[in-house]
Interface confidence: medium
């Protein structure tokens, strides 16, 4: 099982994201909408605009997901799209609230095994590769709502029913209460609230802040784990360098995470993943001889 895989990688025990963003409000710059005789003005935001073919992408992803996951076959994807659209269309893209997404949350309600949740921060690709192999574990993007929105950008315009394909608010330069940030904050909070028993989190050991309080994991998920349900948060620190044998579980930011978690009456443990490629290989083929001996 997983313990053998960890053992095979000289894992050391230490008992004991999505982008979340600073709450900074900006207004965006006003630019003329055309060179006609009656110039109109529209908001020019600092971030990229809505992903091309956004409606079609959301609808197609919904159909694909519900086909693959029998437990979600009851979901009406047109209603899901209507609810998604309703959360941000005609609304000021700096004034979006969690309540705006409630109809979508309701339609996307999904039960995942609460003891099989994998959180991640700044290392999405490896987390997804892992759950693709370890099929009984789930990241947020393995749920319907996370799958729908993964890697997409969207926003509307106040008082018009148009999607803004040109620009959307950047969380730092414009505002934090934008459609994308509020969506991820909402679904991340719900995902963390649902977790139980041992919750795993994959962290990027190559970053200067292995645990970042300003990430979605650090600012939303950590604070919404329920101490009455969650016994342990287990961090997996993923090493980047081939010859990197440092114990990153001793990193000051990991100690900070341990402190936050302990204060919430949840136990904390940490493991180094020295060889992520080897780690994935051993998850795929646990019987491999190199996965039962220490490397």
């Amino acid at each position: 099982g997983l313990n053998d895989i960890f053992e095979a990688q000289k894992i050391e025990w230490h008992e004991g994201s999505h982008h979340h963003h600073h709450h900074h409000h900006g207004s965006g710059s006003l630019v003329p909408r055309g060179s006609g005789s009656v110039p109109r003005w529209r908001q020019q935001w600092s971030g990229p605009g809505t992903t091309k073919r956004f409606p079609e992408t959301v609808l197609a992803r919904c159909v694909k997901y519900t086909e693959i996951h029998p437990e979600m076959r009851h979901v009406d994807c047109q209603s899901v799209w209507d609810a998604f659209k309703g959360a941000f269309i005609s609304k000021h893209p700096c004034n979006i609230t969690e309540e705006d997404y409630q109809p979508l949350m309701k339609l996307g309600t999904q039960t995942v095994p609460c003891n099989k949740i994998l959180l991640w921060s700044r290392i999405k690709d490896l987390a997804h590769q892992f759950t693709q192999v370890q099929r009984d574990m789930f990241t947020l993007e393995d749920t319907l709502l996370g799958y729908l929105a993964d890697d997409l950008t969207w926003c509307g315009e106040f008082n018009t029913s148009k999607i803004n394909y040109q620009s959307c608010p950047d969380w730092r330069k414009d505002c934090s209460n934008n459609p994308v940030s509020v969506f991820w904050k909402t679904v991340s909070r719900r995902f963390a609230e649902a977790a139980c028993d041992v919750v795993h989190v994959m962290l990027n050991g190559s970053r200067s802040k292995i645990f970042d309080k300003n990430s979605t994991f650090g600012s939303v998920e950590v604070h919404n784990l329920q101490p009455e349900k969650v016994q342990t948060l287990e961090a997996w620190v993923i090493h980047g360098g081939r010859e990197d044998s440092r114990d990153l579980c001793q990193d000051p930011t990991i100690k900070e995470l341990e402190s936050i978690i302990s204060k919430r009456n949840i136990q904390f443990s940490c493991k180094n993943i020295y060889r992520p490629d080897k780690f994935l290989q051993c998850v795929k083929n646990p019987e491999d001889s190199s996965c039962t001996s220490e490397i």
Epitope: G34, G36, P39, I163
Partner: antibody, heavy 119, light 111 residues
Framework: QVQLKESGPGLVQPSETLSLTCTVS????????VNWVRQPPGKGLEWMGR???????DYNSALKSRLSISRDTSKGQVFLKMNSLQTEDTAIYFC?????????????WGPGTMVTVLS | QFTLTQPKSVSGSLRSTITIPCERS????????VSWYQQHLGRPPINVIY?????PSEVSDRFSGSIDSSSNSASLTITNLQMDDEADYFC??????????FGGGTKLTVL
């Protein structure tokens, strides 16, 4: 100044493949999208598809199975291939620049090239 | 996908004002911007209005565009009609996936 010009064969046999080239100047294909639009004699305009400035491609769903759009950014050329031609594909074929600015219209057009599918 | 419906022909006398409507079949006319093109015989189309009511700088201020929610239509209005305005006019919009939709075109005759 901005210019687009279509080129290709004037006559095509039924069931053959049409290959057209749109050569642009005065702007970069990495900054603007290029669309293909056709107009049968005496009829209206039909959008066929586009290649975005980032290289991604969209097709009119009614023509999707027969169409292929590509480009060579270094030469400033956009290519249209359409297979299984029939007489109803006889039309003037235009390429048009589509600015990526949220309004989705065409600010510059080529003069068009007439393609006749022989009956 | 919606359609855009225009009258086949419209006529007006010299120096008069005409309006060409363009009706959207489903969804709100305000959901997506409308543009207008003028096409003289044997020539490529020229954009005369974009973003519902915006006019390119080189286009005469006799051309104006508007949208009307009550009729779910866009309109192109040409004032002080000139002989050179005799042409085909096409409205154009796009769906939410930015697929382009043209109206069938209106032949304007100047009497």
């Amino acid at each position: 100044q901005v210019q687009l010009k279509e080129s290709g064969p004037g006559l095509v046999q039924p069931s053959e493949t049409l290959s057209l080239t749109c050569t642009v100047s005065g702007f970069s294909l990495t900054s603007y999208g290029v669309n293909w639009v056709r107009q049968p004699p005496g009829k209206g305009l039909e959008w066929m598809g586009r290649i975005w400035n980032d290289g991604s491609i969209d097709y009119n769903s009614a023509l999707k199975s027969r169409l292929s759009i590509s480009r060579d950014t270094s030469k400033g050329q956009v290519f249209l291939k359409m297979n299984s031609l029939q007489t109803e594909d006889t039309a003037i074929y235009f390429c048009a620049r589509g600015p990526y600015n949220n309004y989705w219209y065409f600010d510059f057009w080529g003069p068009g090239t007439m393609v006749t599918v022989l009956s | 996908q919606f359609t855009l419906t225009q009258p086949k022909s419209v006529s007006g006398s010299l120096r008069s004002t005409i309006t060409i409507p363009c009706e959207r079949s489903s969804g709100d006319i305000g959901d997506n911007y409308v543009s207008w093109y003028q096409q003289h015989l044997g020539r490529p189309p020229i954009n005369v209005i974009y973003a519902d009511d915006q006019r390119p700088s080189e286009v005469s201020d006799r051309f104006s565009g508007s949208i009307d929610s009550s009729s779910n239509s866009a309109s192109l209005t040409i004032t002080n009609l000139q002989m050179d305005d005799e042409a085909d006019y096409f409205c154009q919009s796009y769906d939410s996936n930015i697929d382009i939709i043209f109206g069938g075109g209106t032949k304007l005759t100047v009497l």
